[in-house]
Structure formats: C-alpha cells, structure tokens
C-alpha cells in the first residue's frame, strides 16, 4: 500500500491519497482524504492531472464549479458531496479510459491552511477467472476464462498435489480480442487433468492478478475465485 | 428550487431554423450540464446533445450537422438551435439537468415547448 | 447506438397488484440507467437514477434493479395515481438512449 502525504507551507494541512487503478469501462474511484474543517464553504477542492492543462474537478463553497473543467473529464466526475465536511475529498470517474492514467493532484484549501498530495492512478483491464471441467474434451481437461484483461497478462497454472510443477507444457493459452478493439478475453486449457486434486489457474499482469481454483473430486466440484490489484500505494 | 423553463417559436415552415432558450434558476451552469431532449407526439424521448459546466458540447450524431448549443453563464440562459427543419422534427422539446455532474439521471426538466413544423 | 428495448408495451393492472417493467440495453452500460414516470400532458419525472437508487421523494414501492443489460423497475402495489408512461434510458455513452416506453393502464 502506498500512502502519500502532502504538507505544504507554514499553515499547512495534511492531505493523504492512494494509488489505485482503473478497470477501463466502468467507474472509478481517485481517493484523497484531508483534515475536516467546520464550514463546508471554507472548502475547496482542486483535482489537477500531470500533462493537462484545465481542471479535472473543482468544488468549492460547497458546490462544484466545472467553468475550467478539461474537455476530457466532461460529464465524468464527481465528488461525494454530502462527505466533503468529514474530510472526504475522494473522486468519482465515469467510464474509465485507458487515456485517464497518470499522475493527479489533490490539491485543498481549507480555513486552516492548504496541502496536496500525487496520486498514481493506472488503468487496464482485469476480471475473475472462472475455472470449469471441459467435458467435451476427449481427456480429462480444465478450461480457465477471464472476459476482460489488459494489458496482455500472464497465465499459469499450478496444482495442489504437484506443487512447484511446471504445467506451461501441457496447457494452452489463447486471447482474443473483444469487440471494443481494447481488452481480450483471456482463455486457458489445462491437460491431462488428475481428480482428486486442487488447481489454480493464475492471471496477472501490472496492475492485477487474479486466481481461479478448482477442487475436482469423484463426487463434487468446487470453485474459488479472487481477484488483487496490484500496487495500492498511498502519498 | 431549481427550475427550467423553455422559450420557443411553436410553429417553424419548414427547412427554417428553430431557436429555444432554457432559462433555469436555483443553481449554476457552471456547476451543471444542460440537456436537450425531445418527444415527436406518440413517441418516445430522443436524446439531442449537452452543452457541459465548461461550455463544451457533445450532440447526437444523426444531428450534429444541423444542431448548435451555447450558453450566457451570467444570464443563466441556453440556447438551442436546430436548422433545416422537416415535418417529422415536429415533437415537445425539452432542456433537462442532471441529477448529478456524472449524466445519471436527468432530475430537473423543464415544462417543455412544442415546436409544429408546418407549413 | 445503444438500443433500450422495453417490455411490455402496455399493461393493464389493478390497484394493489405488483407490476414488474423490463428494460434491456443492446450493450452493457454498467449501472447508468436511469427510469421515468410521464403523465399525460406533463414533463417526465425521475424515479429511480443509477439503476437502484431512488430519487428523493419518489415512493418506496418504486424500486430499480439491474446492471450491465437487463434492468427492472418494480411497483410493489400499484395506485392509481401510477398510470402512466414509464420510460428507462441509458447515459454510459453518446449518444445517450432512451427507450420507447411502457404504458401502465389501471383497470
């Protein structure tokens, strides 16, 4: 977790931001949290992005002010409004675009002084696995899909009993490309499959790694999935 | 309260321009976009363009060629103009606000102002 | 575009009875579906905005429910004063949609 904190001159207020990222398509969060003052209209909260030259969002007495908003964040952002006087100056962007990553500032003021603080923000593309028994194989085989990966990640596949086992010889990987040119389905066949026995098929790339188990025995079949993004970072 | 209000011609010739003014209150529009929507009679609402907080603009593609939106900040006032007008334009514009600066829901519309494009 | 297709048409229903409205969207627009209220001779009112989320002063028995395509608007016990046009729309991408409506009779 990367935490950044930002203190600035000699009535200074303590500003704090996590690095996050992005899953391009839907909505995402920009965190900042800053020292609460007691007036909402002493407020003002200024989010700025390295390379661009208009605002990305401004709020201030106690309402948002969009005159100086860049054309790229038209429409898409919001602060949480009814949270800005407990110190929550955290960021609501609308259909995440690969464009949307870079370095961004949270800059307040507020009665009692001012701070800012970067924030890190990558976008990609990544969803839970989901790992099945492909019974249309001629052997016993598992099929591992992830409909929204980006960038390209890595896939491999490892098992319970053989731990340290190097499955990259008896398993295929494949990606296609979805329909909005961007992310690629991620799909992945396991041979030669043993029962009694727990797989895990490992998506990761920069920004996630995502995991789908599958304990396959005589009488059932269960499945895990989780999902980690990768560098959370605050400043 | 925030309010809308539309102002318009009711009746265009047709291939003639139409003009409308939303005049709102109760809030900015340099904190809000401002929507236009409209609804041919019997039918269903037709999502026309915006013009957001900044005074860009993004317009429906089947009528970008034809339709402008501006604003006065300080008269609280959008304007909206469509050219070359055609009998099947004749429907009850509408200016509408968000609920919130992310287009989540229109929350605030205005009474509407029917447009006839007839001859 | 993104189409919004709303089912049914039309329906007619009695007061106190449970009304279940559909609203299916051609591509995933994530949870931005927003659902109308028309009355005759009025502009559209908003009920629910974000898919679930009531707007202030609409009535607990209008509920939304839904992402990605498929989208509900529930009535719990329909009144009289529901009958109306209901409309979803969609503001994930331009342009924004809107679908054609459902017309609520009461019998």
């Known amino acids: 977790l990367i935490i950044g904190f930002g203190i600035s001159g000699r009535h200074s207020i303590t500003v704090t931001t996590v690095a996050s990222a992005g899953n391009i398509g839907e909505d995402g969060i920009l965190s900042c949290t800053f020292e609460p003052d007691i007036k909402l209209s002493d407020i003002v909260i200024q989010w700025l992005k390295e390379g661009v030259i208009g605002l990305v969002h401004e709020f201030k007495e106690g309402k948002d002010e969009l005159s100086e908003q860049d054309e790229m964040f038209r429409g898409r952002t919001a602060v949480f409004a009814d949270q800005v006087i407990v110190g929550n100056a955290s960021l609501r962007l609308k259909n995440v675009q690969l464009t949307d990553a870079g370095t961004y500032k949270c800059y307040i003021i507020t009665s009692k002084g001012k701070g800012n603080a970067n924030l890190e923000y990558k976008t990609g593309a990544f969803s839970m696995p989901e790992v099945n028994v492909d019974y249309n194989a001629s052997s016993e085989t598992l099929r591992c899909e992830a409909p929204r990966w980006f960038p390209q990640p890595t896939v491999v596949w490892a098992s319970q009993v053989d731990q340290g086992a190097n499955f990259s010889e008896v398993s295929n990987t494949s990606f296609e490309l979805n329909s909005e040119n961007v992310t690629m389905k991620v799909v992945s066949v396991l041979y030669n499959v043993t029962i009694n026995n727990t797989y895990s098929c490992m998506i990761e790339n920069d920004i996630a790694k995502a995991t789908g188990d599958i304990k396959v025995t005589e009488s059932e079949i269960k499945r895990r999935s989780h999902l980690q993004l990768l560098n959370s970072k605050a400043s | 309260q925030m309010q809308l209000q539309e102002s318009g011609p009711g009746l265009v010739q047709p291939s003639q321009s139409l003009s409308i003014t939303c005049t709102v209150s109760?809030?900015?529009?340099?904190?809000?976009?401002i929507h236009w929507v409209r609804q041919s009679p019997g039918k269903g609402l037709e999502w026309l363009g915006v013009?957001?907080?900044?005074?860009?603009?993004d317009y429906n593609a089947a009528f970008i060629s034809r339709l402008s939106i501006s604003k006065d900040n300080s008269k609280s006032q959008v304007f909206f103009k469509m050219n070359s007008l055609q009998s099947d334009d004749t429907a009850i514009h509408y200016c509408?606000?968000?609920?919130?600066?992310?287009?989540?829901?229109?929350?605030?519309w205005g009474q509407g102002t029917l447009v006839t494009v007839s001859s | 575009n993104i189409v919004m297709t709303q089912s049914p048409k039309s329906m007619s229903m009695s007061v106190g009875e449970r009304v279940t409205l559909s609203c299916k969207a051609s591509?995933?627009?994530?949870?931005?579906v927003s659902w109308y209220q028309q009355k005759p001779e009025q502009s559209p009112k908003l009920l629910i905005y974000?898919?679930?989320n009531r707007y202030t002063g609409v009535p607990d028995r209008f509920t939304g429910s839904g992402s990605a395509t498929d989208f509900t608007l529930t009535i719990s016990s329909v009144q009289a004063e529901d009958l109306a046009d209901y409309h979803c729309?969609?503001?994930?991408?331009?342009?924004?949609?809107f679908g054609s409506g459902t017309k609520l009779e009461i019998k």
């Open positions: 509408a606000r968000d609920i919130t600066t992310i287009a989540e829901g229109f929350a605030y």
């Open positions: 109760g809030f900015s529009l340099t904190s809000y976009g």
């Open positions: 013009i957001w907080s900044s005074g860009s603009t």
């Open positions: 591509e995933n627009v994530g949870t931005y």
């Open positions: 974000g898919a679930s």
């Open positions: 729309g969609q503001s994930y991408s331009y342009p924004f949609t």
